[in-house]
Amino acid sequence: SQVSQNCHNGSYEISVLMMGNSAFAEPLKNLEDAVNEGLEIVRGRLQNAGLNVTVNATFMYSDGLIHNSGDCRSSTCEGLDLLRKISNAQRMGCVLIGPSCTYSTFQMYLDTELSYPMISAGSFGLSCDYKETLTRLMSPARKLMYFLVNFWKTNDLPFKTYSWSTSYVYKNGTETEDCFWYLNALEASVSYFSHELGFKVVLRQDKEFQDILMDHNRKSNVIIMCGGPEFLYKLKGDRAVAEDIVIILVDLFNDQYFEDNVTAPDYMKNVLVLTLSPGNSLLNSSFSRNLSPTKRDFALAYLNGILLFGHMLKIFLENGENITTPKFAHAFRNLTFEGYDGPVTLDDWGDVDSTMVLLYTSVDTKKYKVLLTYDTHVNKTYPVDMSPTFTWKNSKLPNDITGRGPQ
């Protein structure tokens, strides 16, 4: 049935799906706080622009009885159930914020005639790429893949003089939602990453990973994994590691590396950490006070989703254009808007662009230091530390295949 949108005559509503199954185990109250903080900012911005309109959010909760795994496994049905609820109530906002699970987003996108924009804090998987009315405000797997290929090919930096073409990927099935889809993308045989690499093997058992660390017959010196330092320690412990092993630890949504007085543990010396450039004003904000550094990005994505809607609403209203049109639904891409923590850029497909940061552990101070940054918008690497104090020989990253000469 045709659902009417509460989206005209000076009153604009945002439908926020509050799903029990979520990409991050974040209390829904915190997400509500983020949304409400966003609404306050949007109202202020619209008022400053001389637009006297009402903007509200409706929080749509699922019953939580059937879909109670808490992670994303049963999210497909939960998302569709919520859409059914919207349909039965005959009431939909101008925009849908949520869901965050790849499964539910993919299914909801398939099963609905989307004439309204959908904003997601998550939906990391490749199956959610290139969706015309979907905007993703947390770095999707495609962006990670492009960084890795770019970095693997790089061979003209003082600290990386070899192109790499091989890798192990550690993926044991217990990953968080973001890591699951990041590693899934690297594993997929048809992905850009697999296409560009000559050799790639997925390690699924702890023992496989542990054996590779000192295996003289290993096919690659590079191992990609996803999670925090504690996750690596559980797996690696204090085991000896061959001197030319490089572990790439993908830990995008974790600000802890940038906090004052953080010292890197010994087991991180062979590790390069890939994370996102941290925000600066988040630490003091009211909605983030109760959040762990890992969860700030999730709540921030909800908040920025509200600000993005406010940005688009302002543009359309100033131009005298209708909000309930396909044009509005398709407009949430290829733009930069003022997010909570500074400008946020969305690419041609509505996916957030960001600065990824590769960190290493300095032998001088046992502190994390930035090796390079990568701008996902232009697919370009910018070296920061031209003479890093690495643990690796000659302060250069080793070749990816032991015993192979310069490429």
Epitope: Y257, F258, V262, T263, S277, P278, N280, G342, T355, V357, L359, S362, V363, D364, T365, K366, K367, Y368, K369, V370, T373, V384, D385, T389
Partner: antibody, heavy 122, light 110 residues
Framework: QVQLQQSGAELARPGASVKLSCKAS????????ITWVKRRTGQGLGWIGE????????YYNEKFKGKATLTADKSSSTAYMELRSLTSEDSAVYFC???????????????WGTGTTVTVSS | DIVLTQSPASLAMSLGKRATISCRAS??????????IHWYQQKPGQPPKLLIH???NLEAGVPARFSGSGSRTDFTLTIDPVEEDDVAIYYC????????FGGGTKLEIK
């Protein structure tokens, strides 16, 4: 509290060498760098170089390569700077300071020694 | 090397007034959203004292009369209100590349 105690004033002949010391206390010596800064009368501050006691790695301003040599003794939490082939241009006050490194790879100097005056005169 | 130009070279202020000292870098000293400029105060016969690190972060124990601002190439140290005890030379330091200090600004009381 964190302190850097520098050695006393030095009077030296042109062509000679001097070795200045900087003893650290009140913090873990190997967790920070020690930087050295020169101040000549009527002139500003000039960065000489830095040493990281944990690794022994040293970093020099090109202008002072060959003039200054930085070393550190972890057991006594003391950093040293040797200045050689002294000329009147080397007459100055030399400060040591604790270097804090941050994740973006920069340094700043939060605690300073009281300075050592070096006078080069025949 | 990055050159830091401080202005004015000297400054005579009345007590209670606002003093502003500028530090301009020959190229950007910002990196990943962090401004790599630090401010020091040096009184006669004393070592320099850290006032502000990373452009705007007040060092512990430094009075709130001191504040810093700016980004990329243009930075400002503000003292408001100026007190007798503030007579000193003020230096900016950049740590984006090989460390360099500005030429200094001498603050005196009228």
């Amino acid at each position: 509290q964190v302190q850097l105690q520098q050695s006393g004033a030095e009077l030296a002949r042109p062509g000679a060498s001097v070795k200045l010391s900087c003893k650290a206390s009140g913090y873990t010596f190997t967790s920070y760098g020690i930087t050295w800064v020169k101040r000549r009368t009527g002139q500003g501050l000039g960065w000489i170089g830095e040493i990281y006691p944990r690794s022994g790695n040293t970093y020099y301003n090109e202008k002072f390569k060959g003039k200054a040599t930085l070393t550190a003794d972890k057991s006594s939490s003391t950093a040293y700077m040797e200045l050689r082939s002294l000329t009147s241009e080397d007459s100055a006050v030399y400060f040591c300071a604790r270097a804090i490194t941050t994740v973006v790879g920069d340094w700043y100097f939060d605690v300073w020694g009281t300075g050592t005056t070096v006078t080069v005169s025949s | 090397d990055i050159v830091l130009t401080q202005s004015p070279a000297s400054l005579a202020m009345s007590l209670g007034k606002r003093a502003t000292i500028s530090c301009r870098a020959s190229e950007s000293v910002s990196l990943i959203g962090t401004n790599l400029i630090h401010w020091y105060q040096q009184k006669p016969g004393q070592p320099p004292k850290l006032l502000i690190h990373h452009a705007s972060n007040l060092e512990a124990g430094v009075p709130a009369r001191f504040s810093g601002s700016g980004s990329r190439t243009d930075f400002t140290l503000t003292i408001d209100p100026v007190e007798e005890d503030d007579v000193a030379i003020y230096y900016c330091l950049q740590s984006r590349k090989i460390r360099t200090f500005g030429g200094g600004t001498k603050l005196e009381i009228k």
